[in-house]
């Protein structure tokens, strides 16, 4: 690229006209402040391209950088561009105007920065001061760029004298920023709301001082924008929060809400999403099934659990035989309903050292103004079996009988067994099961009674032995779902004078 005049620094008269020419082997263009001003482009017969920029009626505001660059950098050295700096000394222009963002200088580390106060005349003496101080700071000045050095977090101004008047620049603010990788968290006051209620979401970024939040949400897609509010959590340093608040939600507001956070210093970004459901009205729904018959074991503790979903939070009541239950002062019953997630609940009834009287019909009812659900079951108290009596008798009929009586819940099964070789029984020889077969020459008669008050079954079984010719060990075993109990008796023949 060939620039005429070559510069690199030109000082031009105010109100004059000046022509800049740039030529190259490919199309060239003049740029000023990242824009292309009106210019005359041409191609010569020898294939050289040129662009002529005519600056007319120059003022101090034309002071600055001018670049000539290839219009199309394909296949060319992309970094080839020529820079000219033009001064137009203009007593009517003090310091060149800055964009608002140039007045705020952000630092993420201790590094040299430039306070870009520039004048139109390279002959002017410019000094740098703290905003509230008169002493000139010993910082080198470049008329094309400004003051460069390492600065503290303060406010600064530049001063110069044009003719007989002192001119001050705008104030420049230097800030040292806390910057780290971005970590976004999004949460909602509620992820489920009824229509007409408010949706409030919060997006929080930790470890950064300057970030940009951008929300996307269902309402935005239909062009209905909501203005988020950003604040700093004063009690937590470097916590910035953006709040998106949608009053009076509609069903169409259901969907994904995304918070995208960008940090321009290091160009980091992160985003998180959350789903919001807007329901027409509240609900209560049972999750999973609870059998209509539940069991508890006597004197053991038992927790009965119901899981359900609800919004808004419901009231939960437990009933036994249609009477309301509450936490008992004696600590025999404990009720608790806990929120395991925003809309999921676990309600528990705990019976401590279960008593027979606690058997019955239980109901859990969960309800609010929009819906209700209830779940009922029968609680059965299981009682381990015990043999209450085992006796042998010799009726006049000549047969011998053994009577076994026991109780338990659920209903016990009875098993009779006998062993004829007392020396080897029961370790070496298994006992023989007795029943209603003729081989055993025994008969069995069993009666079962349910005792309502005690809520358990009583089993009475009588074993009739036709003839006993030698001592016999007879065992009565009662079994149910929660245990078993055994007793045994030695039955001796009529002819023997003793029993054991």
């Amino acid at each position: 690229l060939v620039v005429t005049p070559p510069g690199p620094e030109l000082v031009l008269n105010v109100s004059s006209t000046f022509v800049l020419t740039c030529s190259g082997s490919a199309p060239v263009v003049w740029e000023r402040m990242s824009q292309e001003p009106p210019q005359e482009m041409a191609k010569a017969q020898d294939g050289t391209f040129s662009s002529v920029l005519t600056l007319t009626n120059l003022t101090g505001l034309d002071t600055g950088e001018y670049f000539c660059t290839h219009n199309d950098s394909r296949g060319l050295e992309t970094d080839e561009r020529k820079r000219l700096y033009i001064f137009v000394p203009d007593p009517t222009v003090g310091f060149l105007p800055n964009d608002a963002e140039e007045l705020f200088i952000f630092l993420t580390e201790i590094t040299e920065i430039t306070i870009p106060c520039r004048v139109t005349d390279p002959q002017l003496v410019v000094t740098l001061h703290e905003k509230k101080g008169d002493v000139a700071l010993p910082v080198p000045y470049d008329h094309q760029r400004g003051f460069s050095g390492i600065f503290e977090d303060r406010s600064y101004i530049c001063k110069t004298t044009i003719g007989d008047r002192e001119v001050d620049s705008d104030a420049y603010y230097v800030y040292r920023l806390q910057v780290s990788s971005i970590n976004v968290s999004v949460n909602a006051v509620q992820t489920v709301v009824r229509q007409g209620e408010n949706i409030t979401l919060m997006c929080i970024v930790i470890g950064n001082e300057v970030v940009n939040f951008e929300w996307t949400y269902p309402r935005k897609e239909s062009g209905r924008l909501v203005e988020p509010v950003t604040d700093f959590l004063l009690d937590m340093p470097y916590h910035i929060r953006s709040i998106l608040h949608i009053p009076s939600a509609e069903l169409e507001d259901s969907g994904t809400y995304t918070c995208n956070v960008t940090e321009s210093v290091n160009d980091h970004q992160d985003e998180k999403a959350i789903n919001i459901t807007v329901v027409e009205s509240g609900y209560v729904r049972l999750l999973g099934e609870v059998g209509t018959l539940q069991f508890a074991e006597l004197h053991r503790s038992r927790t009965l659990q119901v899981v359900f979903e609800a919004y808004p939070p419901p009231t939960v009541l437990w009933f036994k035989d249609n009477r309301t239950l509450g936490d008992s002062s004696a600590g025999e019953i404990a009720l608790s309903t806990r929120n395991v997630s925003e809309t999921r609940y676990v309600s528990e009834l705990t019976l401590v050292r279960v008593k027979v009287a606690e058997a019955g019909h239980y109901t859990m009812r969960a309800f609010h103004e929009d819906a209700e659900v209830q779940l009922s079951f029968q609680l059965q108290i299981n009682v381990p079996v015990r043999v209450l009596e085992l006796s042998e008798s010799h009726p006049d009929s000549g047969e011998q009988t053994v009577r076994c009586r026991g109780r338990g819940m659920p209903q016990p099964n009875i098993i009779w067994s006998a062993c004829r070789d007392l020396k080897r029984c029961p370790r070496e020889l298994p006992p023989t099961l007795l029943g209603n077969s003729s081989e055993e020459e025994s008969q069995l008669e069993t009666n079962v009674t349910y005792w309502e008050e005690e809520q358990e079954f009583e089993v009475v079984s009588t074993l009739r032995l036709q003839h006993v010719d030698r001592p016999l060990s007879v065992r009565c075993t009662l079994r149910n779902a929660v245990g078993q109990d055994t007793q045994e008796v030695i039955v001796v023949p009529h002819s023997l004078p003793f029993k054991v």
Partner: nanobody, 120 residues
């Protein structure tokens, strides 16, 4: 003090022609552009034609096709050939040169002006 010397003005009838000349002193190192400006009574000064050191020319719309600017770099001369003159071309015509003596600082200087009057 740099002095530009103009010549060639005068009274001419509508449709007639005039050629203006302007000479810059030899002490000038480099000229960026030389041009002709005019100022009619009660009006602001306006550009008529401009020629750069590279020979690029610029004209005011009102004179395109009628006036021609040309230059001689070696002699540091600029000329304005004015044809098909109209009464509205009546004005004082000033020569202007933007030049440098050190390639960094550029100055623009004006001639004293030469009167052109187009009238029947």
């Amino acid at each position: 003090e740099v002095q530009l010397v103009e010549s060639g003005g005068g009274l001419v009838q509508p449709g007639g022609s005039l050629r203006l000349s302007c000479a810059a002193p030899g002490s000038i190192v480099s000229i960026n552009n030389m041009g002709w400006y005019r100022q009619a009574p009660g009006k602001q000064r306006e550009l008529v034609a401009l020629i750069t050191s590279g020979g690029t020319t610029t004209y005011a719309d009102s004179v395109k096709g009628r006036f021609t600017i040309s230059g001689d770099n070696a002699k540091k001369m600029v000329y304005l050939q004015m044809n098909s003159l109209k009464p509205e071309d009546t004005a004082v015509y000033y020569c202007n040169a933007v030049f440098t003596t050190d390639t960094r600082n550029w100055y623009d200087y004006w001639g004293q002006g030469t009167q052109v009057t187009v009238s029947s």
